[in-house]
Each structure stands twice: as C-alpha cells, then as structure tokens.
C-alpha cells in the first residue's frame, strides 16, 4: 500500500467518525487520516466498517473484507458533508449492532473501535455515549478514542477502555497524521507465527505464538489461545505467559498425523476471536526424534 508499518491482524475494525457541524472545515483532514490508517490494516481476514454520526448515526460502509468495497467506502467517506449535533452514542449503537449480528462462521470476531470526535459532549450526550460504548465493550469490543481540538480528555477516557486508549490531538486537525503510527501500534493485535508450526501426533507440546498487541487486553487473565481443529472443533487453552509480542500456550494433543489446527486468540475469555492464517500441523515422529 503506502509502505511503513502495517497490521496483519484478522479482526473487525470500526471507524466511528464525528461529522457534526463543528468539523465542517476539517473533513478533509479526517478523511485523509482514516484513508491512511485504513491502508495499514492489510490482513485478508480483517473486516472494516465506516460509521458517521451527527444528529444520527449512519453506517456509511457496512463491515467488509472486500478491498474494492473498502475503496468505494473511502470514496463515499470523502463526499460526506458535515452538519448537525454530536450524537456519538448513535455511532456506537450502529457499531454494536454489527458486532452483534455479523458473526463469522458461528463465532464472534474480535472488534476494535476507533471513535473520533472534536468537541466536548454535554451532559446527557456524554452519559449516552459512555453507556453505548460500555454496551459495545459488553459485546467484546476494544474502544479507542481520538480527540481533536476542543475535546474533554476525561470524558474520552471513560468512553474509551482507559486513559491509555485515548489519543489526544491538541494541535488541531492537521496534526491527525502525526498519531497514525501510535494508533496503529496500539490498536493492532496480530498473530504472525507459531513455534513449532509442526508438532508430533499424540504428544503434548507448548506453542509460542508470536505476534503483537497481546497485552492490549483490558485484563490479561482473559487472554486465550484457541485452536480450531480441522475446521470443526475449537479448543481454548489458557496461556502460561502473556507478553505483548508472544504467548506461551499449551497445544492440544492432536492424535492423528495430518491434522491441522488454525490458531486464533481471544482477548476476552472466548467472547470473540482474532483470526490468523497461522496453522499448526501434526506429523509422525519416530521414538527418539
């Protein structure tokens, strides 16, 4: 795409964008921020949705992994004409509805929400936004907030998962470009490799899952390694160790040669899963090997 760091994680990414009247003269900066960030998530298993809010929330692009649809969605995003109030809660509701209904092959995909706003939310609107963000979290989402210009950081820390999930942009909209790298680093949860990738049939093993962002979980005690065996049975295992760039997990005992286990990771005790193209296969090992 445009070079530089990228994210290979397979999850659902929601952009919830303020298009209220106060961003009227800054929509281009918001668009270019989203466009550049979107191009850095490159897993074929990553799905993306664009949601805009003002006096109501609208799904501009429903959840899709189709890169052509994402390109068209970005074109639609560029055409948005801001105006109206800052009903951020409406944006979260649109995201939650998709999280709730758009599961993949019978399991819920992990969801990351990046919500951007430029103003302070007054009284009821803050209460509503916090409540709807909590409901998104109840469905397994990780919530990040980007605050530009006249935002209230204390409010955004309560809407986001924590203060660490807030990206303040104090120097105005033109400074949005400067946080792309840090947002990418923080919001990316990816599985890159498993060591060993081949294990002996019928024997117990430990697997090192290499990746990034495993400590982004709200509670690292809720991180699970998940093995989808031969596209049917899924076994979840609690890791022995959770570090940001690797997990140490017990591998399930796979009795037969040629069995395949696709690796997934849950950050929330199995409520939802980050997918990958990493596969562990079994082979025949002779005694003493």
């Amino acid at each position: 795409e445009d070079g530089g760091p990228a994210c290979y994680g397979g999850f659902d990414l929601y952009f919830i964008l303020d298009k209220s009247g106060s961003v009227l003269h800054h929509w281009n900066e918001i668009y270019y921020f989203v466009e550049q960030l979107a191009h850095k998530f490159i897993s074929p298993q990553l799905r993306m949705s664009f949601i805009v809010f003002s006096t109501r929330g609208t799904t501009l692009m429903k959840l899709t992994e189709d890169r052509e649809q994402i390109r068209q969605g970005l074109e639609e995003l560029q055409k948005v004409l801001p105006g109206g109030d800052t009903y951020m809660h409406e944006g979260f509701e649109r995201a939650s509805e998709q999280i709730y209904y758009e599961n993949r092959q019978g399991y819920r995909t992990a969801s990351v929400i990046i919500a951007l706003t430029d103003g302070e939310l007054h009284e009821d609107l803050f209460f509503y936004s916090e409540r709807e963000a909590n409901r998104s979290r109840d469905l397994g989402a990780i919530v990040y907030c980007v605050g530009v210009k006249d935002f209230n950081e204390t409010q955004l820390a309560r809407i986001a998962d924590s203060k660490d999930h807030v990206f303040p942009v104090n120097d105005g909209f033109q400074a949005l470009q400067g946080i792309i790298h840090s947002i990418l680093k923080k919001s990316c949860i990816e599985i890159l490799a498993a060591e060993p990738s081949t294990i002996c049939a019928g024997e117990s093993f430990q697997v090192v899952v290499r990746g990034n962002g495993f400590r982004h979980a709200r509670n690292v005690d809720r991180v699970l390694c998940s093995f989808k065996i031969n596209d049917s049975v899924t076994l979840n295992e609690k890791p022995f160790s959770v570090e940001d760039t690797y997990l140490l997990c017990p591998a399930p005992i796979l009795k037969e040669v040629g069995m395949k286990a696709a690796l997934q990771v849950s950050m929330n005790d199995g409520l939802s899963f980050i997918s990958s193209s990493v596969i562990i296969t079994t082979t025949h090992c002779s005694d003493g090997s």
């Epitope: 609208t58 959840l63 899709t64 509701e93 649109r94 998709q98 209904y101 758009e102 509503y128």
Partner: antibody, heavy 115, light 108 residues
C-alpha cells in the same frame, strides 16, 4: 421517507407454504438489518426472524427449521418463506427495519392458517 | 434467554403521569426500546436505547433503565396516548430480539 410495504399474506391450509415480501424504499436498504415481527389476533408482538446487512440470519425458536428469511438488495426487497405452517402461525406479519430497535414498520399482511 | 415482564394494564387520569414498567434479569446491560400500538395500526417506536426519543415523538415520552427495570414515563398524559405499549430488548448471549407481553394504557 422510509416506506415498507408487505405483501403475500392470505389463507393457507396447515402444512402449506407461503412467501411474504416486503418492498423497501426511502433508505439505503443494503446497510440495514431487516426483520419480521408477527402479532396473533388479540395477542402481543413476537419477533420472528432477522437478516443482518451482511445476510447473517436469525430465527425465533418457534419458527426455526420452517421459516427462511432472505433479502435481494438489488430489488430492495425482504422475503419470508414459510413452510409447514401451523394454526399457531396465524398472525399479522410486519416487516421492520431492525437493529437493536425496530425504527420503521410496514402496515402488515395477514396470514391465516386454517383448514 | 432474557424474559421481559410488563403489567397487563395501567390506568391514568388525563394530565397525570403514567409509568409502565418492564422487568427482566440484567436488563440494564441491554438497550431497551418502547413501542406504542393503537388498534388496527402498526407499532410506532417511541423510545430507543433506554431513553432516546425519535424525532416526531412528543417530549412527554421519556424512558429510563436501572436496577432490573426499564420504565416508560408519559408526563401530562393525553387521551390520544391510550394504546398498547411494548418494551423490547435483546439477549447478549445469542442474537435474539425479545418483546414484553404488552401493557394496555387506559386514559380515564
């Protein structure tokens, strides 16, 4: 403005089949989940089925395996194929734009299952 | 599955405040909507996400959700508010949309 118009209701014998349609206009149909809700004579509302914008489908236990919801985004139309109909399926069937709420409803179409 | 319980009927004098309750386990975790249905008509959404009013719905309609009960409040009830009212929510564990049994509001 948003408009939902149901059709296809009528009298059918127990064990028979019927296909309901709902023509939608006034909104971006393919971006919304859509649902069927029914109301038996003199009774309350009962959710029947939902199809998400990405075409994932969900059903109430009472109709699972008998009813099939589908959508044709090119025609802005929602469908409900009802098979193995029973007397207790007699109701007015409403098509509704859905999510966590049903924010727009059609006027309904009456399905009567009787011999 | 989540079950929503409503009183079958509520009566109120014109100009007074009517309160219709909807109870269910863990209801505050879920978004509650309310619908008004008049005889022979389709339901109309009057409150969504616990307390939000769609455009065109009079300000006398309000909603709240706390404890194990969601409440629809109609302040200064008018004769035209006489109708059946249904609460509705969803089940977090499996995609299932649920309605309460309905409450008949009579304006005396």
């Amino acid at each position: 403005q948003v408009q939902l118009v149901e059709s296809g209701g009528g009298l059918v014998q127990p064990g028979g089949s019927l296909r309901l349609s709902c023509a939608a206009s006034g909104f971006t149909f393919n971006s919304y989940a859509m649902s069927w809700v029914r109301q038996a004579p003199g009774k309350g509302l009962e959710w029947v089925s939902l199809i998400s914008s990405g075409s994932s489908t969900y059903y109430a236990d009472s109709v699972k395996g008998r009813f099939t919801i589908s959508r044709d985004n090119s025609k802005n139309t929602l469908y409900l194929q009802m098979n193995s109909l029973r007397a207790e399926d007699t109701a007015v069937y409403y098509c509704a734009r859905a999510g966590f709420k049903f924010d727009n409803w059609g006027q309904g179409t009456l399905v009567t299952v009787s011999s | 599955d989540i079950e929503l319980t409503q009183p079958p009927s509520v009566s109120v004098a014109p100009g007074q405040t009517a309160r219709i309750s909807c109870s269910g386990d863990s209801i505050p975790n879920y978004s509650v909507s309310w619908y008004q249905q008049k005889p022979g008509q389709a339901p109309v959404l009057v409150i969504y996400a616990d307390s939000n009013r769609p455009s065109g719905i009079p300000e006398r309609f309000s909603g709240s959700n706390s404890g194990n009960t969601a409440t629809l409040t109609i302040s200064g009830t008018q004769a035209e508010d006489e109708a059946d009212y249904y609460c509705q929510s969803y089940d977090n564990t499996s995609p299932d949309l649920v309605f309460g049994g309905g409450t008949k509001l009579t304006v005396l």
